[in-house]
Interface confidence: low
């Protein structure tokens, strides 16, 4: 038999692992698809991205709503001939997540 | 030009993005390499894993120390011939991280 306390602990753990927006470290240059001679300092920013587990293997944790937040970063061109520019960089921030089918059937077929 | 307050905010953001143990959602079955007819409920647990950014592209955030923590989970075999068993599952928990070379030179050569 399972005692109620243990079940409660397991359930709390499960709730915390479920698909939801989680603070994640995102590499700015790859996010923006910038050229290799442009890089950012810091190279990474913290934003919320969908992550966690879904109940079924056929489902994947995906974003259902997104906002864009502005982060102040140094944009640096190599060679370093000009002063690093302090620029506002807009990065996607997931505000809503859902477990959705990985390969959805074509809705229009 | 950069005012000191902005630099402070940028630096705080950078500190938060750096390579460190972060609470992560881990799928137990794939972690333990269990056979496909055994699965766990909940399927995922929260543990700390190394994540975040390194200063250089040639470095990767890797664990330098690990502990193993025990999680109480239901182990379920398919077909369901027996009652789901409440079992302690040991999962790796990263306690220390460091930015290390992706392809380290062989220290013993």
């Amino acid at each position: 038999f399972y005692d109620i306390e243990t079940l409660k602990v397991i359930d709390e753990e499960w709730q915390r692992t479920q698909c939801s927006p989680r603070e994640t470290c995102v590499e700015v240059a790859s996010e923006l698809g910038k050229s290799t001679n442009t890089f950012f300092k810091p190279p990474c920013v913290n934003v919320f991205r969908c992550g966690g587990c879904c109940n079924e293997e056929s489902l994947i944790c995906m974003n259902t709503s997104t906002s864009y937040i502005s982060k102040q970063l140094f944009e640096i061109s190599v060679p370093l001939t000009s002063v690093p520019e302090l620029v506002p960089v807009k990065v996607a921030n997931h505000t809503g997540c859902k477990c959705l089918p990985t390969a959805p059937r074509h809705p229009y077929s | 030009f950069y005012d000191i307050e902005t630099l402070k905010v940028i630096d705080e953001e950078w500190q938060r993005t750096q390579c460190s143990p972060r609470e992560t959602c881990v799928e137990v079955a794939s972690e333990l390499g269990k056979s496909t007819n055994t699965f766990f409920k909940p399927p995922c647990v929260n543990v700390f894993r190394c994540g975040g950014c390194c200063n250089e592209e040639s470095l990767i955030c890797m664990n330098t120390s690990t502990s193993y923590i025990s999680k109480q989970l239901f182990e379920i075999s398919v077909p369901l011939t027996s009652v789901p068993e409440l079992v302690p599952v040991k999962v790796a928990n990263h306690t220390g991280c460091k930015c290390l070379p992706t392809a380290p030179r062989h220290p013993y050569s």
Partner: antibody, heavy 117, light 112 residues
Framework: QVTLKESGPALVKPTQTLTLTCTFS??????????VGWIRQPPGKALEWLAN???????YYNPVLRSRLTISKDTSKNQVVLTMTNMDPVDTATYYC?????????WGEGTLVTVSS | DIVMTQTPLSLPVTPGEPASISCRSS???????????LHWYLQKPGQSPQLLIY???NRFSGVPDRFSGSGSGTDFTLKISRVEAEDVGVYFC?????????FGGGTKVEIK
């Protein structure tokens, strides 16, 4: 509050090497995007940018003077050192240390260096 | 190198009257990132230069609104709507779009 102060000899002889030190406070040369540079101004004349050094130890020199200049930093001491070889009377100028931002906001008070035998 | 040409060399002014200084660059100062890094400094007698205007038209903090900057490409102007006695000194334009960063020869503003 950002401050920069230049120090070095007031008088140097022709052909000698000039060594100037910039001691700064209010920021760190280990901070991303930070740089410290040198600008000079001959008496009654225009300003001329000489060199700068970045937080990541990248250096940039005015191409015209490149062969005579060396810039280095000591992050722990908050100091930047500029050396200029083979000094000539035409190098007589006030030498300013600046925090390299775009544009230059913070300047040192300057140090007058006279080149004379 | 980018040559920065300032006119006039000397500008005698009457307090309360407007003044205008021109700065012309030998090449466009529009950076590949779209910004134009043309700045104006004032060097008061016996002092270090101090920033007045950055990126063509932005007044630096604490700079009175009688100072304004304008222009684009290669032609730039600094205007003082009503000159005050404390405005005397040498005004320099400067570009930091291209290396080496260069300065104009200066315009000496003095009271008539």
């Amino acid at each position: 509050q950002v401050t920069l102060k230049e120090s070095g000899p007031a008088l140097v002889k022709p052909t000698q090497t000039l060594t100037l030190t910039c001691t700064f406070s209010g920021f760190s040369l280990s901070d991303y995007g930070m740089g410290v540079g040198w600008i000079r101004q001959p008496p009654g004349k225009a300003l001329e940018w000489l060199a700068n050094i970045w937080w990541n130890d990248d250096k940039y020199y005015n191409p015209v003077l490149r062969s005579r200049l060396t810039i280095s930093k000591d992050t722990s001491k908050n100091q930047v050192v500029l050396t200029m070889t083979n000094m000539d009377p035409v190098d007589t100028a006030t030498y300013y240390c600046v925090q390299v931002t775009n544009p230059f906001v913070f300047w040192g008070e300057g140090t007058l260096v006279t080149v004379s035998s | 190198d980018i040559v920065m040409t300032q006119t006039p060399l000397s500008l005698p002014v009457t307090p309360g009257e407007p003044a205008s200084i021109s700065c012309r660059s030998s090449q466009s100062l529009v950076h590949i990132n779209g910004n134009t890094y043309l700045h104006w400094y004032l060097q008061k007698p016996g002092q270090s230069p101090q920033l007045l205007i950055y990126k063509v038209s932005n007044r630096f903090s604490g700079v009175p609104d009688r100072f304004s900057g304008s222009g684009s490409g290669t032609d730039f102007t600094l205007k003082i709507s009503r000159v005050e006695a404390e405005d005397v000194g040498v005004y320099f334009c400067s570009q930091s779009t291209h290396v080496p960063w260069t300065f104009g020869g200066g315009t000496k503003v003095e009271i008539k």
